[in-house]
Interface confidence: low
């Protein structure tokens, strides 16, 4: 029996309320509303959520009550369309309300903004936060859900419940500690960094489903789950892939109640069948629901079964290859991907998908040839360059990272990517290059066998950030091309880009390089971003500048900031020395 085959319910909203419980129901509705209406004030969302919750309770009491038979999209969409300021705040998004379901929901989805114009979240003093937490714990935690959801409109909702649980635990523990800050700040930093990573990973899953379709997502899932559960049978992996695809399709589609409910069912199924899935699940399956689901999603790869036979027998040497392929193409390719992935935890998922694509292309060509076997006999030889390309790239970049350290490695990537796609906005180039640069500290410490899955799959997540940000305001045909042609070849596509010779350098604007005393009070990270912003602008002005020229100017800039931050009259120093720096930089770069 499929995990998600349920009896029909008279009232979907009552069914989900009963399955999830009031607390999770309210939290998920709040996340859903905040992800759709990202500019609405917190209080407005809370009011809407309370109204939906009260309505759900009437349906629990009597499933035949008025409107209880309506779909969740209809109920939630009707509620969102009651917001008075919809047209003023969201402009054309208000036109969605004139549509019927399912078009209305699709319309809301299309208006989700990956880069909403919202103020940066500033962390208050620890004592202020602890007071707010103690004064009204429920509001404090709701505010957390709201602020994260509106800034990350594709955040994986059931996982956000897990983050909120950890957020609550951190405050519960640390607000009574002797040194509140020492206890709390590392935990909040960890939650922030993990949250950003989780959001970006989920954004790639949604992009995969929405831009490349269910087949692309399923292929990714087959490869990843086969690496993770190499002892599981192909049929078991296929079942998990089908169920996982349903969960992510729901969450990416805004069906958060169904998604959370189905994710819980999937975790239950995995734990009930762990003997036939993986030996690594025992600890996960002893945890409470939210922790359990998270733990399963992050579980380490199981050991590979001993003595797996050669792949060539079934996929190259067998006389039935074309017959098997013709009978059920996707099943046969799925089996190939499963068998290859379970043998190669040392490969990235995207590499495995490239190999599967090459195999598919070869069979398409060869199974129509006069001598199919002769034609595809050497197909595995075609894999060698595909495997070596990411291996060499990772080796070179890890060497560069070890030589430079994270900050300077990021700067090297900033220069590299600005020269490739100089039309992209400076904040996007800085954000993406900084994240690309983090691959060094994240992955280069790993042994060879773990480097590629760590690095290349992480780069896929970061490059997807570039793609979704660029899609909002497309400025570069090269970015559009790399982002849309092939999901699995995005990284090689960007790696292959050379300096854009068609780019007309930006006019020099002294204002871009004018700095003030406020830079002295910034945190280290913020100061790095300021310097990296200046670096991108320099490259946009002088794309042909050499590494040495750029280094000289950046060294002068660092010395200038240090000098003026030590000066008694900082503002005057920044004004006077800044003019000299601009003149010297122009001379050094021949501007």
């Amino acid at each position: 029996r499929g995990v998600f085959r349920r009896d029909a319910h008279k009232s979907e909203v009552a069914h989900r309320f009963k399955d999830l419980g009031e607390e999770n129901f309210k939290a998920l509705v709040l996340i859903a509303f905040a992800q759709y209406l990202q500019q609405c004030p917190f209080e407005d969302h809370v009011k809407l959520v309370n109204e939906v919750t009260e309505f759900a309770k009437t349906c629990v009491a009597d499933e035949s009550a008025e409107n209880c038979d309506k779909s969740l999209h209809t109920l939630f969409g009707d509620k969102l369309c009651t917001v008075a300021t919809l047209r003023e705040t969201y402009g054309e998004m208000a036109d969605c309300c004139a549509k019927q379901e399912p078009e209305r929901n699709e319309c809301f989805l299309q208006h989700k903004d990956d880069n909403p114009n919202l103020p940066r979240l500033v962390r208050p003093e620890v004592d202020v936060m602890c007071t707010a937490f103690h004064d009204n714990e429920e509001t404090f935690l709701k505010k957390y859900l709201y602020e994260i959801a509106r800034r990350h409109p594709y955040f994986y909702a059931p996982e956000l419940l897990f983050f909120a649980k950890r957020y609550k635990a951190a405050f519960t523990e640390c607000c009574q500690a002797a040194d509140k800050a020492a206890c709390l700040l590392p935990k909040l930093d960890e939650l922030r960094d993990e949250g950003k990573a989780s959001s970006a990973k989920q954004r790639l899953k949604c992009a995969s489903l929405q831009k490349f379709g269910e087949r692309a997502f399923k292929a990714w899932a087959v490869a990843r789950l086969s690496q993770r559960f190499p002892k599981a049978e192909f049929a078991e992996v296929s079942k998990l892939v089908t169920d996982l695809t349903k969960v992510h399709t729901e969450c990416c589609h805004g069906d958060l109640l169904e998604c959370a409910d189905d994710r819980a069912d999937l975790a239950k199924y995995i734990c009930e069948n762990q003997d036939s899935i993986s030996s690594k699940l025992k600890e996960c399956c002893e945890k409470p629901l939210l922790e359990k689901s998270h733990c399963i999603a992050e579980v380490e790869n199981d050991e590979m079964p001993a003595d797996l036979p050669s792949l060539a027998a079934d996929f190259v040497e067998s006389k039935d290859v074309c017959k098997n392929y013709a009978e059920a193409k996707d099943v046969f390719l799925g089996m190939f991907l499963y068998e290859y992935a379970r043998r190669h935890p040392d490969y990235s998922v995207v590499l495995l998908l490239r190999l599967a694509k090459t195999y598919e292309t070869t069979l398409e060509k060869c199974c129509a040839a006069a001598d199919p076997h002769e034609c595809y006999a050497k197909v595995f030889d075609e894999f060698k360059p595909l495997v070596e390309e990411p291996q060499n790239l990772i080796k070179q970049n890890c060497e560069l990272f070890e030589q430079l350290g994270e900050y300077k490695f990021q700067n090297a990537l900033l220069v590299r990517y600005t020269k490739k796609v100089p039309q992209v906005s400076t904040p996007t180039l800085v954000e993406v290059s900084r994240n690309l640069g983090k691959v060094g500290s994240k992955c280069c410490k790993h042994p060879e066998a773990k480097r590629m899955p760590c690095a290349e799959d992480y780069l896929s997540v970061v490059l997807n950030q570039l793609c979704v940000l660029h899609e909002k305001t497309p400025v570069s045909d090269r970015v559009t091309k790399c982002c849309t042609e092939s999901l699995v070849n995005r990284r090689p596509c960007f790696s292959a880009l050379e300096v854009d010779e068609t780019y007309v350098p930006k006019e020099f604007n002294a204002e871009t390089f004018t700095f003030h005393a406020d830079i002295c009070t910034l945190s280290e990270k913020e100061r790095q971003i300021k310097k990296q912003t200046a670096l991108v602008e320099l490259v946009k002005h002088k794309p042909k500048a050499t590494k040495e020229q750029l280094k000289a100017v950046m060294d002068d800039f660092a010395a200038f900031v240090e000098k003026c931050c030590k000066a008694d009259d900082k503002e005057t120093c920044f004004a006077e020395e800044g003019k000299k720096l601009v003149a010297a930089s122009q001379a050094a770069l021949g501007l």
Epitope: E125, L185, E406, Y407
Partner: nanobody, 115 residues
């Protein structure tokens, strides 16, 4: 359990030097920026100096610039504050914090500068 233990304080003549240490445990020391904060008798906490996670960038309050040097040894999970040309107004309890908080929690180490 996060723990920060300061040491190295003491009584010193004006113009003298001290080196404070802060031993950290219970968290990934190398992943966090650190600060030194001080609290003089009857006054609120005052931020003194900060250093980034890699030990590359450092910052100082105006009152100690040129006299104090912050450093760290990530392998030893230890933060340092070298204090030279000490003045009577540097008398305070010094304690280290994670990030740039001025919330006092650890015991701190007493520095007394006599004239």
């Amino acid at each position: 359990q996060v723990q920060l233990v300061e040491s190295g304080g003491g009584l010193v003549q004006a113009g003298g030097s001290l080196r404070l240490s802060c031993a950290a445990s219970g968290f990934t020391f190398g992943s966090f920026g650190m600060s030194w904060v001080r609290q003089a008798p009857g006054k609120g906490p005052e931020w003194v100096s900060a250093i980034d996670s890699g030990g590359v960038d450092t910052r100082y309050a105006e009152s100690v610039k040129g006299r104090f040097t912050i450093s760290r040894d990530n392998a030893k999970k230890t933060l340092y504050l070298q204090m030279n040309s000490l003045k009577p107004e540097d008398t305070a309890v010094y304690y280290c914090t994670i990030g740039q908080s001025t919330s006092r929690g650890s015991q701190g180490t007493q520095v007394t500068v006599s004239s």
